[in-house]
């Protein structure tokens, strides 16, 4: 049978030929021609045998961690027979292992965060080595965990890798921790092999700092002709704490001004002092205000750090304008009569230097040449002024003060032209018609109307009558409808057109006014001859047809 | 009967690679039950084994010379050969080629051994 | 591998006499895989002994060997003019084949 011990080969030997052992059979004596032949992976290239003596050497380094086992097998011939001494069996070499790995850190780069003040005990980050040695191998994977880099702060739990916070820390002074850590195999026994790694500590802000001012007083300045919603100045708190937790509003003290107000810029964290109400430099030129300014967020088991908030006080200054001039009333409204002769009064404006010193002022009215203002304010007419062409005027009157011409003050003026009844009635249209030779008495030639330019504070009332000469005139009538329209109607039967082809009729037309006016106007009647059923045959003047009246071709 | 018959450079140039072949007569290397080896003997000296070949080129060498030898066979010329490589003064001896008798595993027969010298 | 030592390195003796060569193994060698050589000035080694106590083709009976595990020897039992000469134990039992320094018998 097979003669052999278990075999082993040290990894990473450097020798090239490194003896293993000996395979035998037990009826190999020396009196025999036997030869062993190795087989398997590795045969001829990692391990060779002597054939004639069985012994096996391993010629290449190995390395455990590549590959920690060999399967071979072997054979023994009697070269004598050419035949096979033993059966083919199979044998293992096992590669042992030699602490040639150090600790290796795979997770890194290692970042932790914690927040500052934590209590001592308070768990940051596990960090874990790996040694790619046999554990089982002796303590050549067997690790101990040390700290090279963050005391007092920091610990190490040495089987573990578990970091823990040793001392409290306060991020306002340092916010980040460079911690080494090392790993060594072997327990740490002398030989063994180690590794490290860099662990980042940052640690995050707690609300532990109140803001406070820089400055205990602040001096502002505003314009007096600055609206309101004006941003006259900020004021700066600074809170050593970063984030959420420096946030902060800004607020001033009660009952400490109704004319300021501080609004918090979130962005730059800034107070921006704000004009609530505008000011007057000659009312009061100078204010005084407390501020004062808490974090936006504190959790209840930080309030002890915010207990009392800071607070500064603000000056403000209001600056002297030269305000232009005043006005009495936003806008005026006059009314004056139509055809009032050049000269006449149409009304006062007035306005005021708001400043100390009360310069004269000068009016002016823009774009005008139907009014003139005094220096008094006083506006009268410099023509004479017609309704019906302009019933309003929209101006401008501006006020300028005498010392300083810059100052000006522009305000609406509007001037109703009343009317007066300057206008007489007179026919809405161009009337002209016809009768026909064997029109009946009584027969209605036209309906008219009339209309009147001027404006009539009650309804328009018209009065239609024929002139005098006319009345006298027999051929035709006129009826007043009493709304404003008449009709025209034959006064006889019959019509000759050619002893009078054409008649001119006069109606006289009067309003209602006070005093009343009246106009003439004239009516063109045709004579035609018709047929029977009326329609219009010949006429003098020319050809007309009867379609709504008459049309001019 | 067997003989063995050593062959080559008797000078040899530090670095370079010392040749040697045994040729054999009066039986086959081809006929097997024979490894055919190779010894050297420094100057007043003992012997030292550098290593085998058989017939079908299967080889084993010294561990300690492992790294530069090669022993190669020429069935067609019944010869072996040596070749060791990157040589240095400490190769300067005399190169015996050998018989290995398979069945007692000692070397029944010798050559008459030639001196190597390994100088500039 | 192992290591052979010969004693005593010089062994000086007449004609006649009776030599007694020791080889001593590092560790335990099969008595099959020892032999002993003899090599004369000038001279390539002759194998003289194998598997301890077996002659070679051709060699005297003068010349004998024993021992076994990690000690042997070889015996001339009568001292011929031409015995003298250094004689080497060798190894080959494991790998590598290795000699001991050898023995020189001188003629005294």
């Known amino acids: 049978g097979w003669v052999w011990n278990q075999f082993f080969v040290p990894e990473e030997m450097n020798t090239t030929s490194h003896h293993i052992g000996q395979l035998r059979s037990d009826l190999d004596n020396g009196n025999n021609s036997f030869q062993y032949k190795l087989l398997g992976a590795g045969a001829g290239s990692t391990f060779i045998i002597d054939e004639r003596t069985g012994d096996i050497y391993a010629i290449q380094k190995l390395d455990r961690e590549e590959r920690s086992l060999y399967i071979l097998r072997a054979q023994v011939i009697d070269i004598a027979t050419g035949r096979a001494v033993e059966p083919e069996s199979e044998f293992v070499i096992k590669v042992s292992d030699i602490n040639d790995n150090e600790p290796k850190f795979l997770d890194e780069p290692y970042e932790a965060i914690v927040p500052e003040m934590s209590p001592e005990g308070t768990l940051v980050i596990q960090v874990t080595a790996s040694d790619a040695d046999d554990p089982s191998s002796g303590n050549n994977a067997r690790l101990l965990y040390s700290l090279l880099q963050g005391q007092p702060y920091f610990s190490v739990e040495p089987t573990t890798g578990v970091i823990r916070i040793s001392s409290k820390m306060d991020r306002e002074l340092q916010d980040e921790y460079w911690v080494i850590i090392q790993a060594k195999d072997m327990i740490g026994q002398p030989g063994a092999l180690s590794g490290t790694t860099s662990v980042l500590i940052k640690l995050s802000d707690v609300n532990d700092n109140k803001p406070i001012f820089k400055e205990s007083l602040y001096r502002l300045t505003v314009s007096e002709s600055a609206p309101t919603g004006t941003s006259i100045g900020t004021i700066m708190a600074y809170d050593n704490d970063i984030g959420e937790n420096a946030e902060m509003d800004y607020s001033i003290e009660e009952d400490d001004s109704q004319t300021f107000d501080i609004i918090t810029n979130h962005e730059t964290q800034e107070g921006i002092v704000i004009l609530k109400k505008k000011v007057d430099f000659e009312h009061q030129n100078h204010y005084g205000i407390r501020a004062k300014v808490k974090n936006h967020h504190v959790p209840e088991q930080l309030m002890k750090y915010h207990t009392e908030a800071s607070t500064t006080f603000i000056k403000i200054q209001v600056e002297d304008v030269d305000e232009p001039p005043l006005f009495l009333l936003p806008y005026y409204v006059f009314e004056v009569f139509e055809e009032t002769p050049q000269g006449s009064f149409v009304g006062v404006v007035s306005a005021t230097d708001p400043d100390n010193r009360k310069s004269p002022i000068r009016y002016s009215i823009t774009r005008s040449k139907v009014f003139n203002i005094n220096d008094n304010g006083t506006i009268t007419t410099s023509n004479s002024l017609d309704r019906e062409i302009s019933a309003w005027y929209n101006l401008s009157i501006t006020a300028t003060e005498k010392y300083n011409i810059e100052q000006i003050s522009s305000i609406p003026l509007y001037v109703q032209v009343l009317n007066i009844n300057d206008h007489a009635p007179e026919f809405s249209q161009y009337y002209e018609t016809y009768v026909c030779e064997n029109a009946g008495s009584g027969q209605v030639i036209q309906t008219i109307s009339a209309v009147d330019r001027d404006e009539s504070i009650e309804e328009h009332h018209f009065y239609f009558n024929l002139s005098v000469e006319d009345t006298n005139n027999s051929s035709f009538t006129i009826i007043d409808n009493q709304d404003n329209t008449a009709v025209i109607l034959t006064n006889r039967t019959g019509f000759n057109l050619q002893e009078e082809p054409v008649f001119y009729i006069s109606i006289l037309i009067a309003d209602n006014g006070i005093p009343s006016l009246t106009s003439t106007n004239t009516l063109t009647i045709h004579v035609c001859d018709c047929g029977d059923s009326g329609s219009t045959q010949t006429c003098q003047y020319q050809e007309l047809v009867l379609s709504m009246g008459f049309k001019t071709e | 009967q067997v003989q063995l018959q050593e062959s080559g450079p008797g000078l040899v140039k530090p670095s370079q690679t010392l040749s040697l072949t045994c040729t054999v007569s009066?039986?086959?290397?081809?006929?097997?039950?024979?490894?055919w080896s190779w010894i050297r003997q420094h100057p007043g000296k003992g012997l030292e084994w550098i290593g085998y070949?058989?017939?079908?080129?299967?080889?084993f060498y010294n561990p300690s010379l492992r790294s530069r030898v090669t022993i190669s066979v020429d069935t067609s010329k019944n010869q072996f050969s040596l070749k060791l490589s990157s040589v240095t003064a400490a190769d300067t001896a005399v190169y015996y080629c050998a018989r290995d008798s398979s069945s007692s595993r000692a070397l029944d027969y010798w050559g008459q051994g030639t001196l190597v010298t390994v100088s500039s | 591998e192992i290591v052979l030592t010969q004693s005593p390195g010089t062994l000086s003796l007449s004609p006649g006499e009776r030599a007694t060569l020791s080889c001593r193994a590092s560790q335990s060698v099969s008595s099959s895989y020892l032999a002993w050589y003899q090599q004369k000035p000038g001279q390539a080694p002759r194998l003289l002994i194998y598997g301890a106590s077996s002659r070679a083709t051709g060699i005297p009976d003068r010349f004998s060997g024993s021992g076994s595990g990690t000690d042997f020897t070889l015996t001339i039992s009568r001292l011929e003019p031409e015995d003298f000469a250094v004689y080497y134990c060798?190894?080959?039992?494991?790998?590598?084949?290795?000699f001991g320094q050898g023995t020189k018998l001188e003629i005294k």
């Open positions: 009066g039986g086959s290397i081809s006929s097997g039950g024979y490894y």
């Open positions: 070949i058989y017939y079908s080129g299967s080889t």
């Open positions: 060798q190894q080959y039992d494991s790998s590598p084949r290795t």
